[in-house]
Interface confidence: low
């Protein structure tokens, strides 16, 4: 009832609470001496659903038979109307649609460990959209019965408190659900089940792992578990994989021996129990154990690649590079990197250790055969030397590669060609392509690429440290015992004009024509491979177009001669740069005027 | 017309605790569900814990169970959530939603047509 109902009542047939798709028939009647003060007649008595009109009638009663109504719950306001003022309300009441609840489906029990307790959960089905209770039952050997009832709103799930213990783990015990609310009730199918069929283990704890002698080759994984396991799953994987490794044990007591191992790598151990081989369902997965292997002697063997650079008649600088250890081959934490360095001859050798670094720069004579040899270690042991001969890598011209060409192949990459040398190709054993930046001065601080490719390839595509807008000196190497031959490029992976021209420092005069030195571009103004250099000239005050001389880059040319001017005219002197991708804006502009004889 | 207003929100370290309160106005009949409903940038609003007016049956979402704890006051219209040993996992906007009805079933946000206006809960160190 809404309110007092002091004035009248609002009276529901058959019921407050109906079935979907049923009728309804509402009463509003007026109690005595409650209608209009002066004519009863013209009591008009109207029926509201939620703020909607839908029945009136004049006199002290009013009678509505309503359909349709929705899911849930409506609200019927009836109110009374008279003449010359406001609607006065008299009852109310809220009828509650529904249906009777579905079958509970999908009943299932579980007690989670030995020591827990039974809980059981199922599926309602579609919303009754009335109160519904739910009853849990269940019933065991020896006439013993227990039942819960449920008094949530979303009621899907019940404990019933009590524990199952293992004394007869055959015994069946069924349970039950049943639905009951104002328009019906309904049962779901029994599900019988032993201790064995619910009891789901705790996962397993105090999970640790041991390596006998620091081995990865002898390690063992320890847990505890609930008294009454007899299965075991262990998963385990490196902790930036997402595929898991997976072994099915019996009886494993709380130890398994893992063989398969990576050294120096962290992994993740997760076990799960099960009681019974065929009955009952696998534990949770334990906490995750993250350990890392013991480390193991170095695989493989340094790709290692050298520079020679000629100091004087009797001294050349050797610089020896080499690339890290992928983590499966270095097996460890590389301390240090030994060189070793012999004259074959003599036999003198020198052995150096090296840490935090990949290269390697000495000055040995120029005369004798050299070779070194390079290897890695860990706490456990060396990496097989890689050995070399240091050899002149361009002196065979008839193993130099042909017609070389480096073209850019999409964002920061260059496509290197090259043809096969003129000298017998199968003679060659692989070519090495290296790459570094053009830096003029030839700065050997300048880290180095490389990489090597098989004798029958003829193409190669560098990325790794290629930046755009830099301009790299690239050089093709076949290598066939020990000789070699080379050819170079200048080659970028994406180039725009250059944002400056060159400065122009000095203008000097030579037996009647001119000399012009310049300051190179900075190296992040050139915006790729310098083609050209310009120099344009032109009479001052003068309107006409100006002369020029276009001079192929050379990375060491900073200064050209021009012999065209005249003498005791003043011109004025400035000069661009070009990469393929075009000119360069002015550089500085100089005056200049010739002092020698005319002609 | 029903109305909602929360209040009670605020910033608390983790463990500590907070009450929630909701001033529920506009019913006409005992028939109704109170909800409390909690949303982050990004989810979806979760149900968090509600309560029938008429018999004051409850309920709460696993991840709440044990901490926190839904009450009415039917002489004051008020509906509380304390909030009790708080984590960061907690901090979120906290809305109290109603509707009529005799059932307790369904949590949907969408089954609820009245809502308040939220506060903002924040559980950090």
């Known amino acids: 009832k809404i309110d007092a109902c002091k004035r009248g009542d609002v009276t529901v047939k058959p019921s407050h609470v109906i079935l979907l798709g049923s009728t309804v028939n509402i009463t509003c009647s007026l109690k005595p001496r409650q209608g209009c003060f002066h004519y009863s007649r013209r009591n008009k008595l109207i029926l509201y659903k939620f703020d909607r009109r839908i029945n009136f009638h004049h006199g002290h009663s009013l009678n509505s038979q309503v359909t349709g109504l929705p899911l849930g719950t409506t609200l019927f306001v009836c109110k009374l109307a008279c003449i010359n003022s406001d609607e006065i309300q008299i009852c109310g009441a809220e009828i509650f649609v529904g249906v009777a609840p579905e079958q509970p489906q999908n009943l299932s029990c579980i007690q989670k460990g030995e020591q827990g307790t039974v809980a059981c959960t199922w599926e309602r089905g579609r919303d009754t959209h009335l109160y519904t209770e739910y009853t849990l039952q269940l019933s065991g050997p020896k006439n013993l019965t227990w039942q819960k009832q449920c008094k949530d709103i979303y009621c899907d799930y019940l404990d019933f408190g009590i524990n199952l213990t293992p004394e007869s783990p055959e015994s069946n015990f069924t349970a039950k659900v049943t639905a009951v609310n104002s328009l019906g009730s309904s049962s779901s199918l029994p599900s019988t089940f032993t201790f064995l069929d619910i009891v789901r283990p705790l996962p397993p704890w105090d999970i640790r792992i041991k390596f006998q002698k620091a081995s990865v080759s002898r390690c063992t994984l320890y847990w505890r578990d609930e008294g009454l396991v007899l299965l075991n799953r262990l998963r385990y994987r490196p902790s930036n994989s997402r595929l898991w490794n997976m072994v099915n044990v019996t009886k494993a007591k709380g130890r398994h021996d893992l063989l398969d191992l990576k050294p120096f790598t962290e992994y993740e151990f997760q076990i799960s129990s099960k009681l019974h081989l065929y009955k009952g369902s696998w534990s949770d997965w334990s906490e995750s154990l993250r350990a890392q292997t013991p480390e193991e002697e170095p695989t493989g063997m340094l790709d290692v690649w050298y520079m020679k650079r000629h100091i004087d008649y009797s001294r050349q600088q050797i610089s020896l590079f080499w690339k890290n250890l992928s983590v499966s081959e270095a097996r460890g934490k590389i301390l240090h990197y030994q060189v070793t360095l012999q004259e074959l001859t003599g036999g003198k050798a020198m052995t150096q250790n090296i840490t935090g670094h990949t290269s390697w720069t000495t000055v040995i004579p120029r005369t004798g055969n050299w070779a070194v040899a390079v290897s890695a270690a860990n706490s456990k042991g060396s990496s097989l030397p890689t050995r070399i001969n240091i050899m002149n890598l361009c002196e065979a011209g008839l193993l130099a590669p042909r017609q070389v060409s480096a073209n850019s192949e999409g964002m920061d990459n260059i496509l290197v060609t090259w043809q096969p040398p003129r000298k017998d190709p199968s003679a060659v054993q692989e070519y090495v392509v290296e790459w570094r930046e053009l830096h003029p001065g030839g700065d050997t601080q300048v880290p180095l690429n490389w990489l090597r490719s098989r004798p029958y390839n003829v193409s190669a595509l560098i990325s790794e440290n290629i930046k755009s807008y830099i301009c790299y000196e690239i050089r093709v190497y076949a290598l066939s015992g020990d000789q070699g031959g080379c050819s170079s490029i200048l080659g970028n992976s994406k180039h725009k004009a250059p944002l400056s021209g060159p400065h122009i420092n000095a203008i000097t005069e030579e037996k009647g024509s001119i000399l012009i030195s310049w300051n190179s571009i900075p190296v992040q103004e050139q915006m790729g491979c310098l083609l050209h250099y310009r120099i344009y000239w032109k009479e001052r005050d003068s309107n006409s177009q100006p002369q020029l001389c276009e001079i192929p880059y050379r990375v060491s040319q900073n200064s050209h001669p021009i012999n065209s001017l005249q003498p005791r005219v003043t011109y004025v002197l400035w000069m661009t740069a070009l990469t393929a991708a075009g000119e360069s804006s002015h550089g500085n502009e100089r005056e200049f005027c010739l002092q020698g004889k005319a002609n | 017309e029903v109305q909602l207003v929360e209040s009670g929100g605020g910033l608390v370290q983790p463990g500590g605790s907070l009450r929630l309160s909701c001033a529920v106005s506009?019913?006409?009949?005992?028939?109704?569900?109170i909800a409390w409903f909690r949303q982050t940038p990004g989810h979806e609003r979760e149900g968090v814990s509600s309560?029938?007016?008429?018999?004051?049956?409850?309920y709460y979402a696993d991840s709440v169970k044990g901490r926190f704890s839904i009450s009415r006051d039917n002489a004051k219209n008020m509906v509380y959530l304390q909030m009790n040993s708080l984590k960061p996992e907690d901090t979120a906007v906290y809305t109290c939603?109603?509707?009529?009805?005799?059932?307790?079933?369904?949590?949907?946000?969408?089954?609820?047509?009245?809502w308040g206006q939220g506060t903002q809960v924040t559980v950090s160190s």
């Open positions: 939603a109603a509707r009529y009805d005799t059932l307790l079933g369904g949590g949907r946000p969408r089954e609820f047509p009245y």
């Open positions: 506009g019913f006409t009949s005992d028939y109704y569900v």
């Open positions: 309560i029938r007016k008429g018999d004051g049956a409850t």
